[in-house]
């Protein structure tokens, strides 16, 4: 049998291999050692007994999509039946105090491979034996501790294969410089050690994508925006656009990256080398946002110019013309660069919203029958932008981290947007007050630290009877700078 007979449904063409040459991989036309690595078709009854205590599942993931020329990494993780795990020596053991259908196991081992590998009969002087080889006959690499690696993974894609000895998790990286663009299929077959041979335990496949478009994602955020994922934002407040380039192998690390923005509001093109940009829409409506990312990436050199036409007279032969009969372009020189582009498009809706909220006054409320440890405080609040429909206050400790009380209530505010919010404080001390005004699309926040002093019933009563002069002197309010913009604050005497 050949590798493609074992690993795939159909014999891949040489054309596929020639157009997708993977460095360090081998042609699946090579012979497969079926004596050492038996081949079972899907549905073969032997699969049922390929692993003690159930079936092993192989999970294949990749960091696709990959920009052509970059590395794509595949990870295979083996998921063992319940209560089984791999120990430090590579043996498969039962987890302590773990119950499966068979109950608790007396034998700690599912597979004790250490005992098998110490039996070194048939080895030659190099410590290499006829069974410590891959399916194509290549010997296992003798990394330190290789004897504790008891799984053989065979990766197969684009008419080529790669063999790897490993433990219950392996990772393989492939350079995509010569890979055809588009979706491709990676298949992995996993074998476990079984005496002097190997037994298939799992097969898995996954689609990966190679692209010549830089994979681009844009996150959009805006202060006071209620829902950042609905692509609806507020007029007259800057929106922060942050570009994330999916480049897990850092292929573009040394590339100059340009970001060309069109915000769709007739403000023209904005070109930047910064991945973050702010933009403020000054009109309501729907706008088409377009981003083009350009990076000079390592790439193949352009083919050399053709030689001048041959003169009509015959020229001496330069030897057999069989070395490069197809005129394949030269292998890319690492110094050559090719411009790669990425695109992002979004339709965003701009609406009115609450732009700013300020506490302009804080007043201690006189209580004719005050509680011994309760204070009522009125916050006079103004806002700009649209009219709020709800107000929320969160009262917390002075660090603004531990919430003590949170209250939301609907409000009916006139167009001047001036409202008074009354809140109770239990006991003296310093409190952080977060006050939020909201409507359907926006939430505007301001914060204040206030100090509520001790007060005994007599003094409260006395202050109440005295007609209210100077009551606000018993506490002071301090502003916290939030969102890097200043609020006006007035102490009222």
């Amino acid at each position: 049998k050949r590798f493609h007979d074992v690993l795939g449904n159909e014999r891949p063409s040489a054309y596929m291999r020639e157009h997708n040459q993977l460095n360090g991989w081998s042609s699946d036309e090579n012979d497969w050692n079926e004596k050492l690595y038996p081949v079972w078709k899907r549905g073969d009854m032997r699969w049922k007994n390929s692993w003690k205590g159930g079936r092993v599942q192989a999970v294949l993931t990749s960091d696709s999509p990959a920009l052509v020329g970059s590395n794509i990494t595949f990870v295979v993780n083996l998921v063992f039946p319940r209560c089984q795990k791999e120990d430090a020596n590579g043996n498969i053991v039962y987890e302590k105090n773990c119950r499966n259908e068979a109950g608790l196991s007396a034998d700690p081992y599912v597979y004790n491979w250490t005992a098998w590998s110490e039996d070194s009969d048939g080895e030659n002087g190099t410590g290499q034996s006829h069974h410590n080889v891959f399916p194509d006959g290549k010997p296992f690499p003798h990394h330190p501790g290789w004897r504790r690696w008891n799984f053989v993974y065979v990766f197969h894609t684009l008419g080529q294969y790669f063999q790897k000895l490993g433990r219950c998790s392996v990772r393989v990286s492939v350079n995509t410089a010569n890979v055809t663009l588009g979706p491709q299929l990676m298949e992995v077959t996993v074998y476990r050690r079984h005496g002097r041979a190997y037994v298939p335990i799992a097969q898995v496949k996954d689609v990966y994508v190679v692209t010549d478009q830089i994979p681009v994602f844009v996150t959009m955020s805006q202060k006071n925006d209620r829902n950042s994922s609905d692509e609806t934002f507020l007029k007259d407040l800057p929106i922060t656009f942050d570009v994330l380039i999916h480049d897990p192998s850092h292929f573009l690390n040394y590339s100059t990256i340009n970001y060309k923005w069109s915000f769709g509001d007739n403000t023209g093109l904005f070109v930047s080398i910064n991945h973050t940009v702010n933009h403020t829409y000054v009109l309501n409506g729907t706008f088409s946002l377009n981003l083009t990312v350009k990076a000079a990436a390592p790439g193949p050199c352009p083919p050399p110019p053709p030689p001048p036409p041959r003169p009509p007279k015959p020229t001496p032969s330069l030897g057999p013309a069989g070395d490069n009969p197809l005129g394949l372009s030269e292998i890319p020189d690492e110094n050559c660069q090719i411009n790669r582009y990425g695109h992002f498009q979004a339709t965003i809706t701009i609406v009115e919203g609450i732009l700013e909220v300020n506490i302009i006054q804080t007043t201690d409320v006189l209580m004719l029958v005050p509680g011994p440890d309760s204070s009522l405080i009125d916050f006079v609040v103004t806002c700009q932008g649209s009219i709020p429909t709800e107000v929320c206050t969160i009262i917390s400790d002075p660090t603004c981290e531990i919430t003590q009380n949170a209250v939301c209530s609907p409000v009916d505010v006139d167009e001047m947007c001036l409202l008074t919010v009354r809140r109770a404080f239990n006991g003296s001390g310093t409190y952080c007050v977060n006050l939020t005004l909201g409507d359907d699309t926006s939430l505007a926040l301001t914060s204040t630290l206030i100090s509520v002093p001790d007060r005994d019933p007599a003094s409260s009563l006395r202050m109440a009877n005295s007609g209210g002069g100077g009551l606000n002197d018993i506490f002071e309010a301090q502003k916290i700078e939030w969102h890097e913009h200043h609020h006006h604050h007035h102490h009222h005497h």
Partner: antibody
Framework: QVQLVQSGAEVKKPGASVKVSCKAS????????MHWVRQAPGQGLEWMGE????????NYAQKFQGRVTMTVDKSTSTVYMELSSLRSEDTAVYYC????????????WGQGTLVTVSS | DIVMTQSPDSLAVSLGERATINCKAS??????LAWYQQKPGQPPKLLIY???YRYTGVPDRFSGSGSGTDFTLTISSLQAEDVAVYYC?????????FGGGTKVEIK
């Protein structure tokens, strides 16, 4: 839908060069190799070579090595085939054809460009 | 280069009858073989790829079979619109090569 539109017929003298264009639309241009196939009057089909629009890599048939140059203009989604040192036996209809990803069969063809080489 | 040899050169079949065209490769190209139909003044049209897969929109009277070096295109019931030249092409390796063509006519 996928379309390959070629440039118009050409009449050339022996020894001259001809450059035929093939403009692609309806698919991601850089994702598929483009091939050139020619057909002399009353004859069969003959593969000349291919180009990868993504990076300009080319493979040419030995017969045309040194005489053919395939190029790409990504900005206009156009590939070009230039054949130099023309002789009368180069008189043929030249087709561009798009491959099927990793598979070199051709589901999409240009309409063909007749190149006549005559003194 | 892989040489593709088609037979017969021409074929006359009655309407509704079966037409069979053969294609032989000089080496194993399985399953990378395609079949095309070409009518006068038109580019070729893909019928079958990878030896036996019918391309989208191709009538099911066209079928492909074979493996290794020997392949067959069968038209199970010839229709008037099937009059054309048929070509096989190996898509196993470059240079890609075509058979010489088989002209199908109505008897």
């Amino acid at each position: 839908q996928v379309q390959l539109v070629q440039s118009g017929a050409e009449v050339k003298k022996p020894g001259a060069s001809v450059k035929v264009s093939c403009k692609a639309s309806g698919y991601t241009f850089t994702s598929y190799w483009m091939h050139w196939v020619r057909q002399a009057p009353g004859q069969g089909l003959e593969w000349m070579g291919e180009i990868n629009p993504s990076d300009g890599r080319t493979n040419y048939a030995q017969k045309f090595q040194g005489r053919v140059t395939m190029t790409v203009d990504k900005s206009t989604s156009t590939v070009y085939m230039e054949l130099s040192s023309l002789r009368s036996e180069d008189t043929a209809v030249y087709y561009c054809a798009r491959s099927g990803g990793n598979y070199a069969w051709f589901a999409y063809w240009g309409q063909g460009t007749l190149v006549t080489v005559s003194s | 280069d892989i040489v593709m040899t088609q037979s017969p050169d021409s074929l006359a079949v009655s309407l509704g009858e079966r037409a069979t065209i053969n294609c032989k490769a000089s080496q194993d190209v399985s399953p990378s073989l395609a079949w095309y139909q070409q009518k006068p003044g038109q580019p070729p049209k893909l019928l079958i790829y990878s030896a036996s897969y019918r391309y989208t929109g191709v009538p099911d009277r066209f079928s492909g079979s074979g493996s290794g070096t020997d392949f067959t295109l069968t038209i199970s019931s010839l229709q008037a619109e099937d009059v054309a030249v048929y070509y096989c092409q190996q898509h196993y390796s470059i240079p890609l090569t075509f058979g010489g063509g088989t002209k199908v006519e109505i008897k």
